[in-house]
């Protein structure tokens, strides 16, 4: 009778095992083992027992001990079961961002692992089991469907294999896949709201605001603002589920024309975009041209107003005839025209909006000097010892220098309060002088003596 020990073995793949073949007869003609595995005999004294080291066991095997005794030949098999954990435990790749409300299919693939009867595949969200199935097929595949919820955001999904060899006196061997971190998101169907000027003047700055509500997670939303090819750099303010992106936009002459203003919101693998057109225009203030800004009284003056070729101008409230970018008027300069403002207003229509620009120029008229009765009376009669202020105003542009002298030396204190004395009496020659010439006028001061009773 041939016996084998152990009769059943579970061992790791590539491992070794000692198998003892024994026979009940004392003098067997033959005692040995039949196996395709590499073997070594570990010698022992005696004839009825042999120990073999079987090595590099890669798969389940059934070595057979045999003995040839006087009463016949017999055999005994030992059952070697190889165990090994899977070589690959993998979740099928998925986009990391998933919209809330979508059905997500998790697929786990398991390659290798034995014995399959003891191998289970578990799909997990965090530590929560979603599905548990025995490993079947090569590769074994286990799938489950998850309805994506907002609170799944940041959850780790994984696949675990469990090779449970505890019933065989070994342990539970676990292999876990790389986790798949789910990022859930909500991007509303409504496009972002874009507030910006419809028209923008060259070399100026405008403010653009792009906003959107109902986003999750709002902090992960990417906002792209651009005017044509110019990427804007917005300051983004976040609310609970909204954002507002504010950017300054500067335009130059190169941008002139119709430009596309874009606000794109990217969240997860989706985006929403709003487009708007902005017209960039160049509209310098109209030019007011005076023949000469400073003229002498009586000179003919031409005032011209020139503006943008598409503008319509009015000069001092009078529209150009015909209506267009140019207007002019002619005048003969009078002293009353000194300091007169000539205002040109230009209007340009840009993308349905009327843009107004003004320019004003002042005319200086040189005249005088003048001394007339109204402003410089020729006769004053004042009581002696009274307080009086001699007044004499010379007119002209530039303002004349005025001096009133008696006998060429004694001055009349113009504009000063004086006590009237006899010395003040007499005839004064008032002379007003400027670059435009000089005029003179005689002024007589009479002093009335008090009556003594």
């Amino acid at each position: 009778q041939t016996s084998v020990s152990p009769s059943k073995v579970i061992l790791p793949r590539g491992g070794s095992v000692l198998v003892t073949c024994s026979t009940s007869c004392d003098q067997p003609k033959l005692l040995g083992i039949e196996t395709p595995l590499p073997k070594k005999e570990l010698l022992l004294p005696g004839n009825n027992r042999k120990v073999y080291e079987l090595s590099n066991v890669q798969e389940d095997s059934q070595p057979m001990c045999y003995s040839n005794c006087p009463d016949g030949q017999s055999t005994a098999k030992t059952f070697l079961t190889v165990y090994w954990t899977p070589e690959r435990v993998e979740l099928a790749p998925l986009p990391s961002w998933q919209p809330v409300g979508k059905n997500l299919t998790l697929r786990c693939q398991v390659e290798g692992g034995a014995p399959r009867a003891n191998l289970t595949v578990v799909l997990l969200r965090g530590e929560k089991e979603l599905k548990r199935e025995p490993a079947v097929g090569e590769p074994a595949e286990v799938t489950t469907t998850v309805l994506v919820r907002r609170d799944h955001h940041g959850a780790n999904f994984s696949c675990r294999t469990e090779l449970d060899l505890r019933p065989q006196g070994l342990e539970l061997f676990e292999n876990t896949s790389a986790p798949y971190q789910l990022q859930t998101f909500v991007l509303p169907a409504t496009p972002p709201q874009l507030v910006s000027p419809r028209v923008l003047e060259v070399d100026t700055q405008g403010t653009v605001v792009c906003s959107l509500d109902g986003l999750f997670p709002v902090s992960e939303a990417q906002v792209h603002l651009a005017l044509g090819d110019q990427r804007l750099n917005p300051t983004v303010t976040y609310g609970n589920d909204s954002f507002s992106a504010k950017a300054s936009v500067s335009v130059t002459a190169e941008d002139e024309g119709t430009q596309r203003l874009t606000c794109a919101v990217i969240l997860g693998n989706q985006s929403q975009e709003t487009l708007q057109t902005v017209t960039i225009y160049s509209f310098p203030a109209p030019n007011v041209i005076l023949t000469k800004p400073e003229v002498s009284e009586g000179t003919e003056v031409t005032v011209k107003c020139e503006a943008h070729p598409r503008a319509k101008v009015t000069l001092n409230g009078v529209p150009a005839q015909p209506l267009g970018p140019r207007a002019q008027l002619l005048l003969k300069a009078t002293p009353e025209d000194n300091g007169r403002s000539f205002s040109c207003s230009a209007t340009l229509e840009v993308a349905g909006q009327l843009i107004h620009k003004n320019q004003t120029r002042e005319l200086r008229v040189l005249y005088g000097p003048r001394l007339d009765e109204r402003d410089c009376p020729g006769n004053w009669t004042w009581p002696e010892n009274s307080q009086q202020t001699p007044m004499c105003q010379a007119w002209g542009n530039p303002l004349p220098e005025l001096k009133c002298l008696k006998d060429g030396t004694f001055p009349l204190p113009i504009g000063e309060s004086v006590t009237v004395t006899r010395d003040l009496e007499g005839t004064y020659l008032c002379r007003a002088r400027s670059t435009q010439g000089e005029v003179t006028r005689k002024v007589t001061v009479n002093v009335l003596s008090p009556r003594y009773e």
Epitope: L18, K40, E41, L42, L43, L44, P45, E53
Partner: antibody
């Protein structure tokens, strides 16, 4: 009948070399493992080296690594222990023994004395 | 390396006595422990393999037990030819190591 016979021992100066032989009979050395175990005078047993004659895989004790070489010639059914750079502490009876994990059969031993 | 410690180092006993020798490993070695008997001027002789497995031709009074780190060799009734030195040896991991020996002497 399984038999192991060692030879090659003797007196050698420190730094010298010796080659021990172990002739096996009653079994084929390729079917098992051959070890050398030594015993210093009045001391215990110390495992030295092992060879798998089927593939010449070898393992050594740290105390002899780099100085001793175990080898086998299966055509002669003989194993060898080449000992170089011998030291006084290598003085011992060297036994050739067989089996894998335990030592079931032993030779009579050969004495190696390292002394100047 | 795994250290093997035998106790006692020596003992005196009379014929017919029950003798117990223990061997302790510095770490668990499962049942990979073997016992040898050595008489002066002779090669060691295998008595027990794998802690408790008997050897053909070895008297049944020799038995072994233990697993993990603690092992015992028992001679149920000491005979005159049993006076010798006994060694334990582990084969759990390289290098294989022996205990320092237990000398059994006649009382």
């Amino acid at each position: 009948e399984v038999q192991l016979v060692e030879s090659g021992g003797g007196l050698v100066q420190p730094g010298g070399s010796l080659r021990l032989s172990c002739a096996a009979s009653g079994f084929n050395i390729k079917d098992t493992y051959i070890h050398w175990v030594r015993q210093a005078p009045g001391k215990g047993l110390e495992w030295v080296a092992r060879i798998d004659p089927a593939n010449d895989n070898t393992i050594y004790a740290d105390s002899v690594k780099g100085r001793f070489t175990i080898s086998a010639d299966d055509s002669k059914n003989t194993a060898y222990l080449q000992m170089n750079s011998l030291r006084a502490e290598d003085t011992a009876v060297y036994y050739c023994t067989t089996s894998g994990y335990w030592f079931a059969y032993w030779g009579q031993g050969t004495l190696v004395t390292v002394s100047s | 390396d795994i250290q093997m410690t035998q106790s006692p180092s020596s003992l005196s006993a009379s014929v017919g006595d029950r003798v117990t020798i223990t061997c302790r490993a510095s770490q668990s070695i499962s049942n990979n422990l073997h016992w040898y008997q050595q008489k002066p001027g002779k090669a060691p002789k295998l008595l027990i393999y794998h802690a408790s497995q008997s050897i053909s031709g070895v008297p049944s009074r020799f038995s072994g037990s233990g697993s993990g780190t603690d092992f015992t060799l028992t001679i149920s009734s000491l005979q005159p030819e049993d006076f010798a030195t006994y060694y334990c040896q582990q084969s759990n991991s390289w290098p294989y190591t022996f205990g320092q020996g237990t000398k059994v002497e006649i009382k």
